[in-house]
């Protein structure tokens, strides 16, 4: 049903990381416009993007309300120049979103290690505790603020000498590991949220090695 | 239903070497690393090492480097393990395992190999 | 590498009776450590990870404790299907060693 010259959006699909939230879907629009809607299943609707020829919309402002809600998007579409047109049922044509939680859901961005200091045969490995745009109290929450110990990274750290690697894992954003006195070490961190089932693991960080501008090294 | 089926027994010549397969299901095969455990007739579990189905990087203990060689085939959601040189010391169950992070969770039923002339 | 030493190597005990099981770690682990129980014939099936959290389906007779160096698995209220292997894992890092194993014996 709809308008003649209107076609409704397919392909809805949620694009996120680090709860940065984008709704894409298709077609690109040819004689129409598009609204979003959000609600959360128990929520009313809200309005997002209005008669926009884009085909995506950013309802991140939305999502980081509460992180751990599920929800559902859809997608109107208009005829160009006469947005009070309706589908021959009354109601303009639109399509549903998959649901989508973004706690359980957002990729997890790629990790950066942020420094590393050796002192004698320990290096403390720092990972960059990213900042998200989840708010609480006016003030905006790190990755680490948002998932507690459900988010861990792990090294994964080699001798620059060698191809052998080695891991380890912490619940914080802190590694202390034994190296060799004198062997220049390669580093590289990834994040995991154990629990989960789909997008569990984000990219590797950029490889850090010591004897570069990153790392601080201290003979005791 | 979460599976790792594995070949079946194997039994070889010493200095041959064997490739053992790890058949995976009812998961997505490249969110979780695959782990590779030995164990010896009556004897403790030796970890061999692991490989990161998603991009194929390998970890393997230092007693298995030059023995293991960890491969993966995403379209068919199977882990492989090589081994070369073997000897009657290799004679083994073998055990692949999915890797959840905080611990192993669903294992392989296991492949007897017999090293043996 | 981080050494893992699991004691008793064996033990007897009865029906209906509690037994622990130890494992002590060269270096902290923090609590990256899970435990398994193997039957004759059989893989190892996860029992403990994060050294305290049942796994799903487990009794709730195992439990798990301890942090750092040291840490305990209890079995408490024994059953006869409890008479079998037990081993502990270090998965803080690699390589990700088990421990020695406890054979638990029906006295």
């Known amino acids: 049903s709809g308008t003649t010259n209107t076609v409704a959006a397919y392909n809805l699909t949620w694009k996120s990381t680090n709860f940065k939230t984008i709704l894409e879907w298709e077609p690109k629009p040819v004689n129409q416009v598009y609204t979003v809607q959000i609600s959360t299943k128990s929520g009313d609707w809200k309005s997002k993007c209005f008669y926009t020829t884009d085909t995506e919309c950013d309802l991140t402002d939305e999502i980081v309300k509460d992180v751990k809600q599920t929800y559902l998007a859809r997608v109107f579409s208009y005829p160009a120049g006469n947005v009070e047109s309706t589908g021959s049922a009354g109601e303009p044509l639109y399509e549903n979103s998959p649901e989508f939680t973004p706690y359980l859901e957002t990729n997890l961005g790629q990790p950066t290690i942020q420094s590393f200091e050796q002192v004698g045969t320990k290096v403390n490995v720092t990972v960059e505790d990213e900042r998200t745009l989840v708010r609480r109290n006016n003030t905006f929450l790190s990755l680490r603020d948002v998932f507690g110990k459900d988010l861990i990274y792990t090294l994964y750290y080699w001798k620059s000498s060698s191809s052998g690697k080695k891991t380890a894992k912490t619940n914080t954003n802190e590694f202390l590991i034994d190296v060799d006195k004198g062997e220049n070490y390669c580093f590289s961190v990834q994040a995991v949220i154990p629990s989960r089932t789909v997008n569990r693991k984000s990219t590797d960080s950029p490889v850090e090695c010591m004897g570069q501008e990153k790392g601080e090294f201290r003979e005791i | 239903e979460i599976q790792l089926q594995q070949s079946g027994p194997e039994l070889v010549k010493p200095g041959a070497s064997v490739q053992v397969s790890c058949k995976t299901s009812?998961?997505?095969?490249?969110?979780?690393?695959v782990y590779w455990v030995r164990q010896s007739h009556g004897k403790s579990l030796e970890w061999i090492g692991y490989?990161?189905?998603?991009?194929?990087?390998?970890f393997y203990d230092e007693n298995f480097m030059g023995k293991a060689t960890l491969t993966v085939d995403k379209s068919s959601t199977t882990a492989f393990m090589h081994l070369n040189s073997l000897t009657s010391d290799d004679s083994a169950v073998y055990f692949c395992?999915?890797?959840?992070?905080?611990?192993?969770?669903?294992w392989g039923q296991g492949t007897t190999l017999t090293v043996s002339s | 590498d981080i050494q893992m030493t699991q004691s008793p190597a064996s033990q007897s005990a009865s029906l209906g009776e509690s037994v622990t099981i130890t494992c002590l770690a060269t270096q902290t682990l923090d609590t990256w450590l899970a435990w398994y129980q193997q039957k004759p014939g059989k893989s190892p099936q996860l029992l403990i990870y994060?050294?305290?959290y049942l796994a799903d389906g487990v009794p709730s007779r195992f439990s798990g404790s301890g942090s750092g160096t040291k840490f305990s698995f209890k079995i408490s209220s024994l059953q006869a299907e409890d008479f079998v292997n037990y081993y502990c894992?270090?998965?803080?890092?690699?390589?990700?060693?088990f421990g020695a194993g406890t054979k638990l014996e029906l006295k």
């Open positions: 009812g998961y997505s095969f490249t969110h979780f690393n």
């Open positions: 894992q270090l998965v803080y890092s690699s390589p990700s060693t």
């Open positions: 395992a999915r890797d959840v992070t905080t611990a192993v969770d669903f």
């Open positions: 994060a050294a305290t």
């Open positions: 490989i990161d189905p998603d991009n194929g990087i390998t």
